[in-house]
């Protein structure tokens, strides 16, 4: 079997064997090595010498196999845009940002660039659970039967109605989607406007 060509090697068809780790250099019509993540090209390749790579300086990075002559500057997560840091910048990875709690991504350009406050869900509803936190605005859905939620909130969850009998009490008024069951002591009389509405 033929020995594997090691960069730099000639390429007549302008393609290289390993597209991820090699690139075509048109001036010399050769395939050269890319620099691994966390490094940059400190000296370009020639027919007799492969690419020379150097480590990115502090506060800079390159995420992919590359033939860049500089490293990208690390950028902080912009709190004014509603972003917070979840992982610091390293030589191999940019700063990882996400929307602050209670916010969602409103502008996306390869990554989130701007977050906005989640909409409140009105009483009787809750925010539908999403696969990914911060991915989109709240979509409010009604409380299921037997549950209630009595605030305007981006995060409040529907709670089950109180079962009066579990507390040794009786129901004075049934619960709705927006209010809990009202319980009372079984010995207490009903208020005048409710007399006759309770089954004994």
């Amino acid at each position: 079997s033929q020995p594997q060509a090691v960069p730099p090697y000639a390429s007549e068809n302008q393609t290289c064997r390993d597209q991820e780790k090699e690139y075509y250099e048109p001036q010399h019509r050769i395939c050269c090595s890319r620099c691994p993540p966390g490094t940059y090209v400190s000296a370009k390749c020639s027919r007799i010498r492969d690419t020379v790579c150097a480590t990115c300086a502090e506060n800079s990075y390159n995420e992919h196999w590359n033939y860049l002559t500089i490293c990208q500057l690390c950028r902080p997560c912009d709190p004014v845009m509603g972003l917070e840091e979840i992982a610091p910048c390293t030589s191999k990875r940019k700063t990882q940002c996400r929307c602050q709690p209670g916010m969602f991504c409103a502008a996306w350009a390869l990554e989130c660039t701007h977050c906005e406050l989640l909409s409140d869900c009105p009483p009787g509803t809750e925010a539908e659970l999403k696969d990914e936190v911060g991915k989109g605005n709240n979509h409010c859905v009604p409380c299921k039967a037997g549950h209630f939620q009595n605030t305007s909130s981006p995060s409040a969850r529907c709670q089950p109605h109180t079962r009066c009998e579990n507390q040794g009490l009786v129901e004075a008024a049934p619960g709705t989607a927006q209010s809990d069951t009202t319980c009372k002591n079984p010995l207490e009389p009903l208020p005048p406007e409710m007399s006759g509405t309770m089954l004994m």
Epitope: D120, G124, E128, V141, A145, A177, Q178
Partner: antibody, heavy 128, light 107 residues
Amino acid sequence: EVQLLESGGGLVQPGGSLRLSCAAAGFTFSSYPMTWVRQAPGKGLEWVSLISPSGATTYYADSVKGRFTISRDTSKNTLYLQMNSLRAEDTAVYYCAKNHYPDDVIIKNYYFYGVDVWGQGTTVTVSS
Amino acid sequence: DIQMTQSPSSLSASVGDRVTITCRASQDISNYLNWYQQKPGKAPKSLIYAASSLQSGVPSRFSGSGSGTDFTLTISSLQPEDFANYYCQQTHTIPYSFGQGTNLEIK
């Protein structure tokens, strides 16, 4: 023009199954909750089931809970109602309907405003 | 569950009459009340949402009012095409429920 077209109704024996479909057109199907309502012969309207736009949240009337399943396929703009363990009392015309969302409402909640568009209905008869 | 009660169950009226149908909820439902019209053999048609807001394309002779537990649908001047069944529906608390219907017929 917003259109809803139900299909899949028919005659089925008690205990049998049926799947109703509702093809939607003329609106962004993936943005709206959808509802099934039924009407037994000579009777009034009965709310059956509701599904959120994502399909992640579903609701059922007690009379069908555990037997019926509502679902949606956004790629096909279609709403479904899978009906199992059918009973004589499930005999009805089944309507699919699009939930209404008024333009002037600030808080995005599509559920409080009823439905604004109805399909023509499909008849389900459960009989031996 | 919230019960919806319509009255009257049936009603005879003449073209040009002013007609009122009422709907009562067993609990406070704020203004989450909708009205629908249905003609025999046809699908329902949406008339009013949020107790008093007219659906697009519905004639202005239809109006709705009320809040809490008591609601009304008013037709200011009956037209021949208005003879039909009318249903109210609450969308305050799951399960959403309909009234039993009001049959509006020609006198």
